[in-house]
């Protein structure tokens, strides 16, 4: 939808002044020829003939895969997540061997109570999804578990998840400090050993639209860039219109080459155009310049 369809014109002149017929092929672009059966097709840039037409590889398009697209689809995940590996020590339950068996009644009951307790602890965190016990061991019950966080992808997702992990740390520290045994008895849903609370590891989803854009642009990586619209990243070349980085070719057509974007200027019946942005018009009959 964002790719610009080439406009047919009488002839196009590059900003250097030479006349080029369309569709134009940059001589610096590597050319490969794909042959299938008796059909010889000039499918360039790694494209292949499927029997009817050239199937082009990103970022190329066109009858012979000779043109470079103006935008490349990049799809960030809808949601991004973080996983925190935590350890807490529950003192209101005494460890038994049955707790090691995840299908036992003991484990299921412990899991239910622990999940209820953690849902209460983290209830104010919008990114909180749940907890997952990974291991239970002696002392009273040392609970190794994951706290799962999730949020919608935005350009600031890392900050959002980093903030959420900080709040998790604060909340678990608070509850394990406050909910402690008194006289060998627990009046809370669960009681903890304050010193047994540890954050072992934090893993955050890694998604970099700039990196994906550069990878997909291949040898044009230096000329494609990411711009955001409605919090969504777009991988565009300067030939894509409507963005901050868009190149204005005025009386001409923007084309990507391996040296970057350039303007191919239009020659009409009355004028020819030149200049880097095809903004210098010369009237054919009067040889008069308009700026």
């Amino acid at each position: 939808p964002l790719a610009t369809i080439p406009v047919s014109t009488t002839s196009l002149t590059s900003s250097e002044g030479s006349t080029i017929s369309t569709p134009s092929v940059d001589i610096s672009t590597p050319v490969t020829t794909s042959i299938v059966g008796d059909q010889c097709s000039r499918c360039k840039n790694g494209g292949f003939w499927d029997g009817l037409k050239c199937q082009c590889l990103t970022p190329y398009y066109g009858e012979s895969c000779e043109e470079v697209v103006n935008s490349i689809d990049i799809a960030p995940p809808e949601t991004v997540s973080a996983q925190m590996e935590l350890t807490v020590t529950v003192t209101s339950v005494k460890f038994t061997d049955e707790l090691k068996n995840h299908s036992s009644q003991e484990f299921r009951e412990f899991n239910k109570t622990f999940t209820e307790q953690m849902n209460i602890v983290y209830s104010g965190i919008p990114e909180y999804v749940g907890v997952n016990i990974t291991n239970l061991r002696l002392g009273s019950v040392v609970v190794e578990h994951d706290v799962l966080l999730r949020t919608k992808y935005t350009p600031e997702y890392k900050t959002a998840l980093d903030n959420a992990t900080e709040v998790v740390k604060q909340k678990i520290t608070k509850v394990t400090t406050e909910q402690i045994m008194t006289n060998d008895n627990c009046s809370a849903l669960m009681c903890f050993n304050t010193t047994g609370t540890q954050v072992q590891n934090i893993t955050v989803t890694q998604y970099d639209p700039v990196e994906e854009c550069r990878q997909k642009a291949e040898e044009y990586e230096d000329y494609f860039l990411v711009e955001y619209r409605d919090q969504k990243p777009y991988c565009i070349s300067p030939c894509e219109s409507g963005f901050n980085a868009s190149k204005n070719c005025n009386h001409g057509k923007c084309q990507m080459s391996q040296n970057g974007a350039r303007c191919l200027c239009v020659t009409t019946e009355t004028h020819w155009y030149s200049g880097e942005d095809c903004n210098q018009g010369t009237q054919k009959s009067h040889h008069h310049h308009h700026h």
Epitope: S92, V93, E109, D184
Partner: nanobody
């Protein structure tokens, strides 16, 4: 399926005694923990006493020295001996079970409950 049935409640005068029983079925009684809770009219349910499979017992401050919790694993039964009863002990008494060796007298920590038996202390 875990089933707990309480009995032994009734009307008793202040200073008197009662023995509550709880018959358990549907699980290995000797494992985990058993407890007694009570709920007075218009009040929240509160922990009274707890006994674990390892022999540990715990009591609410309000009943310490007056109530005794015990269990008979051979009979799958839990007991609560209540002495020196007071008017404020009037409540529905519930038996609760857990597969865990619990040290918690918070009702939310317990997942299996009986229907309760009424104890009224009045002159």
């Amino acid at each position: 399926e875990v089933q707990l049935v309480e009995s032994g409640g009734g009307l008793v005068q202040p200073g008197g005694s009662l023995r509550l029983s709880c018959a358990a079925s549907g699980f290995t009684f000797s494992r985990g923990s058993m407890s007694w809770f009570r709920q007075a009219p218009g009040k929240e349910r509160e922990g009274v006493a707890i006994i674990s499979s390892d022999g540990w017992t715990g009591y609410a401050d309000s009943v310490k020295g007056r109530f005794t919790i015990s269990r008979d694993n051979a009979k799958n039964s839990l007991y609560l001996q209540m002495n020196s009863l007071r008017a404020e002990d009037t409540a529905v008494y519930y038996c609760a079970a857990s597969f865990l060796v619990l040290r918690a007298l918070n009702p939310k920590a317990w997942h299996y409950w009986g229907q309760g038996t009424m104890v009224t202390v009045s002159s």
